[in-house]
Interface confidence: low
């Protein structure tokens, strides 16, 4: 008489996570009588997946009715597959007994699970950096399978090359994670720039996942300061202007000092944005020349984004005989810019 054959026709089956997996198994004979059981793995540590004779296995259903007379198809369908279900599945024929006796195993079907990577999460540096400095961005994506994956970095559409990427774990696993670091050299024009981490995987059907980070979160553009004197007004007041230009972010405090004493402090707010994303701010200080006997040293002091203050000074020269208030004659004064 022919020996009983347990036939598992597929050596491997690949299924997308969330889908159902059908594992096929047929036997060549109804003799001897006895149940079929499905296991994941072999040996003493194997895991019972389905017992067509008894038990309750909510995610597993037989493809054909196992109680039907003359049934020789013991295929199963496992629903809602996750990466944890990957492994080699064996269809095993038992001979009826007390207990049932293992008779023959199929060759096994390896189930691999195609799991989509999670949406890439891009994180930037903890502190801002200025132009010409290099900052690092990190991109992470998890839970994908198989291991093969492609990750690319772009800055404003141009691919970055200073990149280091790792896929973990190195060995076999039910799912994998990728971590990549890109080094980006900042320029003053990068306030509106964006870095994109693009992940391509077989499960994404050619439509890669993207994570983004705005360089505006990573960059600090320090301001330029210029202090100038406008022509003297008829009332012997001099208008001194401090122009703070091309800075980012907006967080800025400006303090006027007259001869080293604080005259006024202002905070920047609701400034219009330049085309390049930076901001400009102009502050004025009126100096009554008549009230001073000596030259006045004006200092525009700017604290930007928590950085050490930057100063720009300007001396208003007061003539030996200042005119009375309201006189139409200009005071004899000259301005000198000092750092």
């Amino acid at each position: 008489e022919e020996e009983l054959q347990v036939i598992q026709p597929e050596k491997s089956v690949s299924v997308a996570a969330g889908d159902s997996a059908t594992l096929n198994c047929t036997v060549s004979s109804l003799i001897p009588v006895g149940p079929i059981q499905w296991f994941r793995g072999a040996g003493p540590g194997r895991e019972l997946i389905y017992n067509l004779k008894e038990g309750h296995f909510p995610r597993v259903t037989p493809v054909s009715d196992p109680t039907k007379r003359n049934n020789m198809d013991f295929s199963i369908r496992i629903s809602n597959i996750t990466p944890a279900d990957a492994g080699t599945y064996y269809c095993v024929k038992f001979r009826k007994g007390s207990p049932d006796v293992e008779l023959k195993s199929g060759a096994g079907t390896e189930l691999s699970v195609r799991a989509k990577p999670s949406a890439p999460v891009v994180s930037g540096p903890a502190v801002r950096a200025t132009a010409e400095h290099t900052v690092s961005f990190t991109c992470e994506s998890h839970g994908f399978s198989p291991r093969d994956i492609t990750l690319k970095w772009f800055k404003n559409g141009n691919e970055l090359s200073d990149v280091q990427t790792n896929v973990d774990p190195a060995g076999k696993s039910v799912s994998y994670s990728i971590r990549s670091t890109a080094r980006v050299v900042l320029t003053r024009r990068d306030v509106h720039s964006q870095v994109i981490c693009e992940v391509a995987h077989v499960t994404l059907q050619g439509d890669p996942l993207r994570g983004t980070a705005n360089l505006s979160e990573a960059i600090r553009v320090p301001p330029f300061l210029e202090v100038t004197q406008q022509s003297m007004r008829a009332d012997n007041q001099v208008n001194v202007t401090c122009q703070v230009t091309k800075f980012y972010p907006q967080r800025l405090q400006l303090t006027w000092l007259e001869n080293g004493n604080v005259s006024r402090t202002e905070m920047a707010s609701a400034l219009p944005e330049n085309k390049d994303g930076t901001y400009n701010w102009t502050s004025w200080l009126l100096v009554n020349v008549s009230a001073h006997r000596d030259d006045v040293k004006l200092t525009c002091q700017v604290e930007h984004d928590g950085q050490p203050a930057v100063n720009k000074s300007f001396s208003v020269k007061v003539s030996a005989h200042p005119k009375e208030q309201g006189s139409n004659t200009a005071a004899e004064n000259t301005g000198t810019n000092e750092r």
Partner: antibody
């Protein structure tokens, strides 16, 4: 993920009629398609399921009266020899019961068997 | 073959009230839990509410709940709304794959 029936019409008794269920958004290799009907003024009645692989099964009352087949995106239900008792709205639905319940359902297609 | 007996055939409830419909199987359903509940409104396809006896389908309001095991099953609607007016069917599955049987239905009228 959707299913939609087509092919319902007025036929004379004994004239075979094939209904088609067109699916989108999921794979017929991973899900069975079940057929259910509702005669006018009556309740729902399970007909059968076209499952994965070559597995097709019908309720005991429906065996011999219906056959099923499928392609990659469609499932056909053939009423082999309709009688007036087969007048009903026929629904197809994804699923094969138990932990793969019938969901979603198509809008239904009306079959009228009359001489 | 499996027979599903559903009671009552019709029930009336006020908005905000509670409705229960029961299904009795002639024998234990497959795995003791092969029981689903469907809502059916005229001119529309049936809609899955509950499967595996007590698992709420995606997108179904939590006022619907299912319970039971083996041969006795119950669908409960707590805090009935006017939109719940419909016929509710249980679907039981026997040990044979093809042995899927609907109950006769319960018409819910909302006052």
């Amino acid at each position: 993920r959707s299913v939609e029936e087509s092919g319902g019409r007025l036929v004379t008794p004994g004239t075979p009629l094939t209904l088609t269920c067109t699916v989108s958004g999921f794979s017929l290799s991973s899900h069975g398609i079940s057929w259910v009907r509702q005669a006018p003024g009556k309740g729902l009645e399970y007909i059968g399921t076209i499952g994965t692989g070559v597995i097709t099964y019908f309720a005991s009352w429906a065996k011999g009266r219906f056959t099923g087949s499928k392609t990659s995106t469609t499932v056909d239900l053939k009423i082999t020899s309709p009688t007036t008792e087969d007048t009903a709205t026929y629904f197809c639905a994804r699923g094969s019961a138990w932990n793969d319940p019938f969901d979603p359902w198509g809008p239904g297609t009306l079959v009228t068997v009359s001489s | 073959a499996l027979v599903m007996t559903q009671t009552p055939a019709s029930v009336s409830a006020a908005v905000g009230g509670t409705v229960t419909t029961k299904c009795q199987a002639s024998q234990s359903v497959y795995g003791n839990n092969d029981l689903a509940w469907y809502q059916h409104k005229p001119g529309q396809p049936p809609k899955l509410l509950i499967y595996l006896a007590s698992t709420l389908a995606t997108g179904v309001p939590s006022r619907f709940s299912g319970s039971g095991s083996g041969t006795q099953f119950t669908l409960t609607i707590t805090g009935v709304q006017s939109d719940d007016a419909a016929t509710y069917y249980c679907l039981g599955g026997g040990d044979d794959e093809a042995d899927n049987v609907f109950g006769g239905g319960t018409e819910v009228v909302v006052k």
